[in-house]
Interface confidence: low
């Protein structure tokens, strides 16, 4: 059997244990919220909303100001003060449910757990490149609340998301808030709602569009929304909410809410419900068909993508695609599968599928039984009439009322399971040259840097590093400021660059200089990294051969040895084809003769695995001498390849140069028909690769070859006669003269 | 302008071999699954095998399954389809075709014009 | 193995006529479901993806419909250059399987 290089695991190129030290912001308290300015005079700022308390950060993340926001009733508030003299309501601390950019104005708009939910609103104020906030202006107007009809209260105790549209002059709050029974009893917050900020910062205008959880399904059927945004003509929120309004409210999925963004109003609401799953290339005994469903979206962000990602997708290039995190339930315990999955919905195909869904809805011929749906917000009835209508009348379109799409989109993991035990709490996405990467921040607080690509059965990583020591899990909110996000750890807020955070956890030269051209790694000298780390001997275009093992380790002094050396960067082609004159061995003072390779023994080599081999003759010189010595590959002139060319000397020691002594045989003598057990003996039998004893010049099949033995069975003789006897070593002559007497059998 | 071209087909014995070719251009080939399907004369259409971006998946019909071997060099922007122990039912005219890549839809979206393979003694 | 049914072999239509052909999959296929045309001597074209998604270049007089087992391609205004045969094909399981066609010829 011939002798095969051991595979090297593809994660040995790389170590994700090395730490990266990242700018950070300690917080004084669990980060609630975060979000981020910058300017068009290159002025910038970052907010850091904790209980009773928002801070205001450079780009530098050094504290500029900060702001208490709690608790109500506290005679310190800042913001509570902006509402005149009090009370305002029960007093108690102020957890931060929302903080968003208007960018029209621009100002930050926060609201509270506190005083109702309300909000209030901070003109920002740019001096130099920091920003201030100036004196808030509380959104509130005293005479226009009441507890059933609500305009400023915003925020809900339970959860709010809001996206911010400008819309003509005015700047429109589009809000989404998660209600139970208790909530909706005090200053009824509204599950959906469109509300247009007064011009003169006094609060919202009354009569405002909104949806709400029926008061009968408040008790069982509660809506978390995961994540809002804003992209073409329309505001999208992202919820994780029961299937059923009449079924186990334990049983949960994923819906898209689509608003549009044009006009303020909600008969064009549309509910779609997003389908993600893991479905393994093999499936399991006993696994659904179509794959394992992952119904609970845990974070969500909506990016442009790259080339790549956008032909796997076949959308064209810089078009937006949702992409969520999903898990198999609430707690995202373990499955079968992996923790965490992450779906893409390109954009385009959610407006087209809810298009589609209008369509079977409102047009002829009308499907018989399809829901309108939504059967928690408004009254059962079926398509193409009105909520709780059995008919359309003349003057009322079927269109101009909220619909849940009857069918679904469904999606699989991009990653194909790949993230495995890795629970994914916060994600960013990034388009970067023509890759797409995934920013995911995780349980255990770490940053993992992926790109978004289908086609692999492995992951390709920018980065995986811990952001600190305190292993707390990310928070789902992520902020981009320049080339940087920001992530939320506990009560830090850390600062990781959208390239990576560097190029040390690249152990080999040929992994470093794969790297993308976006990471800036380079190899010096024996470590990957940015230029800044290392200005000497930095550089971009070279690699040397790296030679990890070799077999033999020892071959006789006369006689040849095939040798097979193991590494990485021999050839930079998987055909191990070379060109003449590029690759020189040489064992001692010896060369080593390239050979050319047998293609019949080249074997796939799994990507999550490398080996290189490469094979030569070693035919000592004349010169060389008994012992211990190195084995050295050079090469040069190698073509360039994709990345680097390869150039340069490898050398391991370890090889010795013996020579092979025959002490003794026996038995001399044995039966004319062969079949004697010979045993030779003598020092460094086993050298070299290969060895034949010859009897009569016709060999003695080997039977055990050891350093101080060989046995071997004996050919049949043609006469009685005593016959030469001789060991060959790498096919030289072993010094000795034996002879073998065949005898009559 | 995505093209696909056939070559390699023709006339073959029962129990013989023949190599079909598929130049590509007008797309980076080395993005796409790509597809054999063939259809016989006065027939449908029949899958035959894919293979993916980086040749690492690879399916087949269970017709062909262990006669044919699909391969690709993304360099030369070529598929190829090497057909062993033919068979009189293999005749067909073979199309190479390109998976359309939305997400992970199996649909062809771009197909050569073709390359007759006739297996006939 | 899943089958995919088109119980019409023929149907015959005029121009302007809206024309519906149909493809039965013998177990749920979602909506992995595709539509081709093909013209004699021609290489297939992809009219619809994702049993509903036109595919892009298509005319929207065309657009398919169903999922699971029962699909439904439809031709709202049959235009001269429509004649041809339709093949669906499934990949929602391996082998990737096609229906053995539909002609649609001049009535």
């Known amino acids: 059997e011939d002798w095969q290089c051991p595979r090297t695991p593809y994660a040995a190129s790389r170590d994700f244990d090395v730490k990266y030290v990242v700018p950070s912001f300690s917080a004084g308290g669990l980060v609630q919220a975060m979000v981020t300015y910058e300017g068009d005079r290159n002025e910038s700022a970052v907010f850091v909303a904790i209980r009773n308390r928002l801070h205001v950060l450079g780009p530098d993340l050094k504290s500029v100001q900060s702001l208490a926001t709690g608790p109500a009733g506290d005679p310190g508030c800042q913001t509570c003060a902006a509402c005149g003299p009090g009370p305002h309501g029960p007093p108690g601390d102020t957890d931060t449910k929302v903080l968003v950019l208007d960018p029209a104005l621009p100002a930050l708009v926060s609201c509270g757990s506190s005083l109702q939910g309300r909000c209030f609103l901070h003109d920002l104020e740019p001096q130099g490149t920091a920003v201030h906030l100036a004196a808030p202006a509380c959104l509130f107007s005293a005479h226009h609340n009441r507890p059933d009809d609500c305009p400023d209260c915003v925020a809900s105790p339970l959860g709010t998301r809001v996206t911010v549209v400008e819309q003509g002059q005015a700047s429109y709050f589009y809000v989404a808030s998660s209600l139970d029974a208790a909530v909706a009893a005090s200053f009824s917050p509204r599950s959906v709602s469109i509300r247009r900020l007064k011009a003169d910062a006094s609060g919202f205008a009354p009569g405002f569009v909104a949806l709400s959880v029926l008061p009968k399904h408040l008790v069982s059927y509660s809506i978390e929304y995961v994540h809002s945004f804003h992209t073409g003509a329309f505001v999208y929120f992202l919820t994780v909410q029961p299937a059923s309004v009449t079924d186990d409210p334990s049983a949960l999925h994923t819906r898209l809410a689509r608003l549009s963004a044009t006009e303020p109003e909600l008969g064009d609401y549309r509910e779609l419900v997003l389908d993600c799953r893991f479905a393994p290339k093999r499936r399991r005994r006993g696994a659904p068909e179509g794959g394992q469903p992952y119904p609970v979206l845990r974070v969500a962000h909506s990016a442009p993508v790259g080339a790549q990602l956008a032909t796997e997708l076949s959308i064209a290039e810089g078009q937006e695609v949702l992409f969520g995190v999903f898990v198999t339930g609430k707690d995202g315990g373990p499955g079968v599968g992996p923790n965490s999955v992450v779906c893409a919905f390109p954009i385009d195909l959610l407006d087209t599928l809810i298009d589609e869904g209008v369509e079977r809805c409102c047009e002829s011929p009308v499907h018989p039984g399809l829901r309108r749906g939504l059967d928690f917000f408004q009254s059962p009835s079926f398509c193409p009439n009105p909520p709780g209508l059995e008919a359309l009348s003349p003057n009322t379109s079927c269109r101009h009322f909220p619909l849940l799409v009857s069918s679904s989109f469904s999606r699989v993991d991009l990653f194909n399971g790949l993230l495995g035990p890795v629970q994914v709490t916060a994600l960013y996405v990034t388009r970067l040259d023509n890759v797409t990467v995934a920013h995911m921040g995780t349980m255990d607080g770490r940053i993992l840097q992926v790109e978004l690509v289908r086609s692999l059965n492995y992951l390709l990583y920018v980065s995986n590093f811990s952001l600190g020591d305190s292993g707390q899990p990310v928070q789902r909110d992520v902020s981009r400021l320049g080339d940087h996000l920001l992530f939320a750890s506990g009560d830090q807020v850390f600062q990781v660059p959208i390239q990576g955070p560097g190029c040390r956890h690249f152990l080999t030269c040929g992994r470093c200089l794969r790297a993308w051209h976006f990471m800036g790694c380079g190899w010096c000298g024996n470590m990957c990294g940015q230029q800044k780390e290392c200005p000497g001997s930095w550089q971009q275009d070279h690699c040397p051969p790296k030679l990890t093992e070799f077999h033999p380790h020892s071959g006789p002094l006369r006689g040849s040895t095939r040798l097979t050396l193991c590494g990485s960067n021999f050839y930079l082609h998987p055909s191990g084809l070379v060109p003449e004159g590029t690759h020189q061995v040489t064992v001692g003072q010896s060369p080593c003769r390239p050979l050319p390779k047998d293609s019949s023994k080249l074997r796939p080599v799994p990507r999550k695995d490398f080996v290189e081999e490469f094979e030569c003759e070693l035919e000592p010189l004349g010169t060389q001498a008994v012992g211990p010595t190195n084995v050295s590959l050079t090469v040069t002139n190698m073509p360039p390849g994709k990345h680097f060319r390869v150039d340069g000397t490898s050398v391991l020691r370890g090889f010795s140069f013996m020579e092979p002594v025959l002490i003794a045989v026996q038995p001399l003598f044995g039966p004319r028909a062969g079949g004697t057990c010979l045993t030779l003996e003598g020092q460094s039998l086993s050298v070299g690769t290969s060895r034949a004893v010859l009897v009569n010049g016709t060999e003695c099949l080997l039977a055990r070859v050891s350093e101080g033995q060989l046995l071997c069975a004996t050919p049949p003789g043609a006469t009685v006669a005593s016959v030469p006897l001789s060991l060959q070593v790498g096919g030289a002559q072993v010094p000795g003269s034996w002879t073998f007497q065949y005898r009559e059998d | 302008e995505v093209q696909l071209v056939e070559s390699g087909g023709g006339l073959v014995q029962p129990g013989g071999s023949l190599r079909l070719s598929c130049a590509a251009s007008?797309?980076?080939?080395?993005?796409?699954?790509m597809s054999w399907v063939r259809q016989a004369p006065g027939k449908g259409l029949e899958w035959v095998s894919e293979?993916?971006?980086?040749?690492?998946?690879?399916n087949y019909a269970p017709s062909v399954k262990g006669r044919f071997t699909i391969s690709r060099d993304n360099a030369k922007n070529s598929l190829y389809l090497q057909m062993n122990s033919l068979r009189a039912e293999d005749t067909a005219v073979y199309y190479c075709?390109?998976?359309?890549?939305?997400?992970?839809?199996?649909?062809?979206?771009?197909w050569g014009q073709g390359t007759t393979v006739t297996v006939s003694s | 193995d899943i089958q995919l049914t088109q119980s019409q072999s023929f149907v015959s239509t005029s121009v302007g006529d809206r024309v519906t052909v149909t493809c039965r999959a013998s177990?749920?296929?979602?909506?992995?479901l595709v539509w081709y045309q093909q013209k004699p001597g021609k290489s297939p074209k992809t009219l619809i993806y994702?049993?509903?998604f036109l595919y892009s270049g298509v005319p929207s007089r065309f657009s398919g419909s169903g999922s699971g087992t029962e699909f439904t391609l439809t031709i709202s205004s049959v235009q001269p250059e429509d004649f041809a045969d339709y093949f669906c094909?499934?990949?929602?399981?391996?082998?990737?399987?096609f229906g053995g066609g539909t002609k649609v010829e001049i009535k």
């Open positions: 075709a390109r998976r359309v890549r939305i997400h992970y839809y199996g649909a062809m979206d771009s």
């Open positions: 293979i993916n971006p980086d040749s690492r998946t690879i």
């Open positions: 994702s049993a509903s």
């Open positions: 177990q749920n296929v979602g909506s992995s």
């Open positions: 007008g797309f980076t080939f080395s993005r796409h699954w």
């Open positions: 094909q499934q990949y929602n399981n391996y082998p990737l399987t």
